[in-house]
Interface confidence: medium
């Protein structure tokens, strides 16, 4: 059960025990549904910089390195929490905000409604 | 520039303009790198419930519906911010925490180190 307004310490504790600094960093290029990463910056938000994935193709890359047009590259999206300065430009007052971000792309078999 | 401790309104504002309630919801099953979603619950954290993706196969699903072991299903991971009660069980005092979550899976060409 959560109160409406709370005190938050912004001194971030990083619980990532994954010591591999690359993590998913090069998957965007090696994936069969490759994506580009776009920087989204907003000084009124914390974190102020968020990276958004945009799928490169409508189709997916096949074994020959060509686009397979019978498949679809689709974004994997996630709702994340950010802090929004409220009122605007406020130095130490924020509101929790839920935003939808595209984290990467995956290749799916499309649902196709064939003509009878 | 952010101060160390701030006031945060937990009355979440949802900025998701995407009106499609399905979003990525069935991609986990239709992807060539399908995944299962596991519930991770922690009452000391806000949000207390986070869903973690786990890839179903080491390989990827091919056009025949079989696993192709020449490819790899890999998790797409993202660092997200959560609030952790600090001190523990505190009703209105939190600390920002960064955690790594797997959002979904994508199919990649593996990096293969051939023997000379």
């Amino acid at each position: 059960n959560f109160p409406r307004t709370v005190m938050v310490n912004l001194n971030i504790h990083n619980r990532n025990t994954n010591t591999n600094p690359k993590r998913s960093s090069d998957y965007y290029d090696r994936s069969t549904s490759p994506w580009n990463l776009h920087r989204n910056e907003d000084p009124e938000r914390y974190p102020s910089v968020i990276w958004e994935a945009k799928c490169r193709h409508l189709g997916c890359i096949n074994a020959d390195g060509n686009v397979d047009y019978h498949m679809n590259s689709v974004p994997i999206q996630q709702e994340i929490l950010v802090l929004r300065r409220e009122p605007p430009h406020s130095p130490n007052s924020f509101r929790l905000e839920k935003i939808l971000v595209s984290v990467g792309c995956t290749c799916v078999t499309p649902i196709v409604h064939h003509v009878a | 520039n952010f101060p160390r401790t701030v006031m945060v309104n937990l009355n979440i504002h949802n900025r998701n303009t995407n009106t499609n309630p399905k979003r990525s919801s069935d991609y986990y099953d239709r992807s060539t790198s399908p995944w299962n979603l596991h519930r991770n619950e922690d009452p000391e954290r806000y949000p207390s419930v986070i869903w973690e993706a786990k890839c179903r196969h080491l390989g990827c699903i091919n056009a025949d519906g079989n696993v192709d072991y020449h490819m790899n299903s890999v998790p797409i991971q993202q660092e997200i911010l959560v609030l952790r009660r600090e001190p523990p069980h505190s009703p209105n005092s939190f600390r920002l925490e960064k955690i790594l979550v797997s959002v979904g899976c994508t199919c990649v060409t593996p990096i293969v180190h051939h023997v000379a």
Epitope: L58, Y69, V74, V115 | Y27
Partner: nanobody, 134 residues
């Protein structure tokens, strides 16, 4: 030479109608998802409508909420042309309208993303100006 050419843009009063055409040359539109996008002065380009390929899908149409019920996208395979019929035009519909083509089939779930992000489209036209003014 492969190209898309838009036409039909004009000055029209609020409430009026226009039909835009997008003619393809050098390739057949049957295999392509076709989208209409627009860019208003000082704004980012946004998707308006798209229609799926007909060679491996059903050629169904998808629209953004702001134009649903007012705009209709259609294709004439014999003429290798896609149309955007725009009715009940509003001042905020003023923009340069572009058509774009990307080969493939489209998942209904992907249509909205296609219109928002436009992927890396295979072909773009140069645009036609639609001005809605009283």
């Amino acid at each position: 030479q492969v190209q898309l050419v838009e036409s039909g843009g004009d000055l029209v009063q609020p409430g009026g109608s226009l039909r835009l055409s997008c003619a393809a040359s050098g390739f057949t539109l049957d295999d392509y998802v076709i989208g209409w996008f627009r860019q208003a002065p000082g704004k980012e380009r946004e998707g308006v409508a798209c229609i799926s390929s007909i060679s491996n899908s059903d050629g169904r149409a998808y629209y953004v909420d702001s134009v649903k019920g007012r705009f209709t996208i259609s294709r004439d395979n014999a003429k290798n042309t896609v149309y955007l019929q725009m009715n009940s035009l509003k001042l905020e519909d003023t923009a340069v309208y572009y058509c774009a083509a990307e080969r493939g089939r489209i998942d209904p779930d992907v249509a909205g993303y296609f219109l928002r992000e436009s992927y890396v489209m295979d072909y773009w036209g140069n645009g036609t100006l639609v001005t809605v003014s009283s």
